[in-house]
């Protein structure tokens, strides 16, 4: 987790003076309590966003919107505190909002926004946003949080930001698999732009069981230039087990931008449709 | 979840010989294809052999008929012996669990006399 590396991040509008502040995710209202606190704030909305660092890559952010409640607490907000939490790592990563000057109800809800926190794809984080000073121990909470969940780089828009496209996101290996005699997969992939090595890994499972019985992995060697964006064909021996006839099959590409991390392409092969067994004619007719 | 830890590495002549063993722990091991792969410095992660949940195996060209690769279910080890080592076989060498993209931290294998 991290802020996308802008020139200098603003909280202010008109009306209000604001800076944002790096935080370390406990405010100083925890460890001294004030007895007046504001409301908690109203229609959180996260979204996801893109936006480009200096140096022109484009990361997904995650746009975080908030109004205030049209109550009197609004004269004792200082600020807030905006946490975002990854939920696979536990990490936390938290700013502040710092007002610096009072705030006053005017003809339109006051609506803050954020979109810095750079999020990674296929991640589900908890994105909570604490008014503060925060409640004394036993006060109604005055926060809202809401989960958000970043899609993985098969989305469109995200298959082109820099994290996705470091990860091989580009490479389209348009696999077909083909079932020949023998107890035979043929495996056709294109291959992509450079010279670097390919694994194959078949996993066979039952019909209808997701506990494997037979793992293959093949290695492709690095092509030559020349073979660049040609089809790449395999021929993969099957383990004549009865029933074991689902076949996965993941591509794992080393190119040089995501090394032994990048994205794999997968195809499955489904178990033959078993034809209707026909209603047994029986051997006498019934009189009635 | 799966971890693997890499041993037996260290320093041979050219023409020694090294046993090299990656343990799993955590994770289904009997059916899992396991690999070893191996990078030289300011090199590529290459592959040097794998072998399958039947026991069939697979190996660069360049260690095929020197380098032999076993695996031991019960103990849930797999095992590399490095026969006629080179001084191009001078890498670290890393354990590979291909269904989930496991990797050991790898073990340094030098040969040089």
């Known amino acids: 987790l991290r802020l996308l590396d802008h020139r200098a991040l603003v909280c202010s509008q008109p009306g209000l003076n604001c800076t944002v502040k790096n935080s370390t995710c406990l405010d100083d209202s925890w460890i001294h309590p004030r007895n007046l606190t504001p409301s908690s704030p109203k229609d959180l909305q996260i979204q996801l966003h893109f936006a480009h660092t200096q140096q022109g890559d484009l990361f997904p952010v995650a746009h975080i919107e908030w109004t205030l409640q049209t109550d009197a607490s609004i004269l004792y907000l200082e600020g807030a505190e905006l946490s975002v939490l990854q939920l696979n790592t536990n990490e936390r990563l938290c700013v502040r909002f710092e007002f610096l000057s009072k705030l006053r109800h005017h003809h339109r809800r006051w609506r803050f926004t954020f979109s810095h926190f750079v999020v990674d794809p296929d991640q589900e984080y908890e994105v909570t946003v604490h008014h503060l000073p925060k409640p004394i121990p036993d006060g109604d909470p005055n926060h809202q949080s809401k989960n958000f969940l970043v899609p993985d780089c098969e989305h469109a828009r995200m298959k082109v930001t820099t994290p996705c496209m470091s990860s091989g996101s580009l490479w389209d290996p348009n696999i077909t698999v083909e079932t020949l005699e023998a107890h035979q997969l043929r495996v056709s992939f294109t291959l992509w732009n450079e010279s670097t090595h390919y694994q194959i890994l078949l996993t066979s499972f039952p019909h209808m069981e997701n506990h494997s019985c037979f793992e293959h992995m093949h290695h492709i060697p690095a092509p030559r230039p020349e073979e660049f964006h040609q089809r790449s064909n395999v021929t993969l021996t099957l383990r004549n087990l009865k029933g074991c006839c689902r076949h996965q099959v993941q591509i794992q590409p080393f190119f040089s931008s995501c090394l032994n991390d990048c994205l794999r392409h997968s195809a499955t092969v489904s178990c033959p449709e078993m034809p209707d067994t026909p209603e047994p004619i029986p051997d006498y007719m019934p009189l009635w | 979840e799966v971890q693997l830890v890499e041993s037996g590495g260290g320093l041979v002549q050219p023409g020694g010989s090294l046993r090299l063993s990656c343990t799993a722990s955590?994770?289904?091991?009997?059916?899992?294809?396991m690999a070893w792969y191996r990078q030289a410095p300011g090199k590529q992660r290459d592959f040097v052999a794998t072998?399958?949940?039947?026991?069939?195996?697979n190996y660069a060209d360049s260690v095929k008929g020197r380098f032999t690769i076993s695996r031991d279910n019960p103990k849930r080890t797999v095992n590399l012996q490095m026969n006629s080592l080179k001084p191009e076989d001078t890498a670290v060498y890393y354990c590979?669990?291909?269904?989930?993209?496991?990797w050991g931290q790898g073990t340094q294998v030098t040969v040089s006399s």
């Open positions: 955590g994770g289904v091991f009997n059916g899992a294809a």
């Open positions: 072998i399958n949940s039947s026991g069939s195996t």
């Open positions: 590979n669990r291909p269904r989930d993209n496991t």
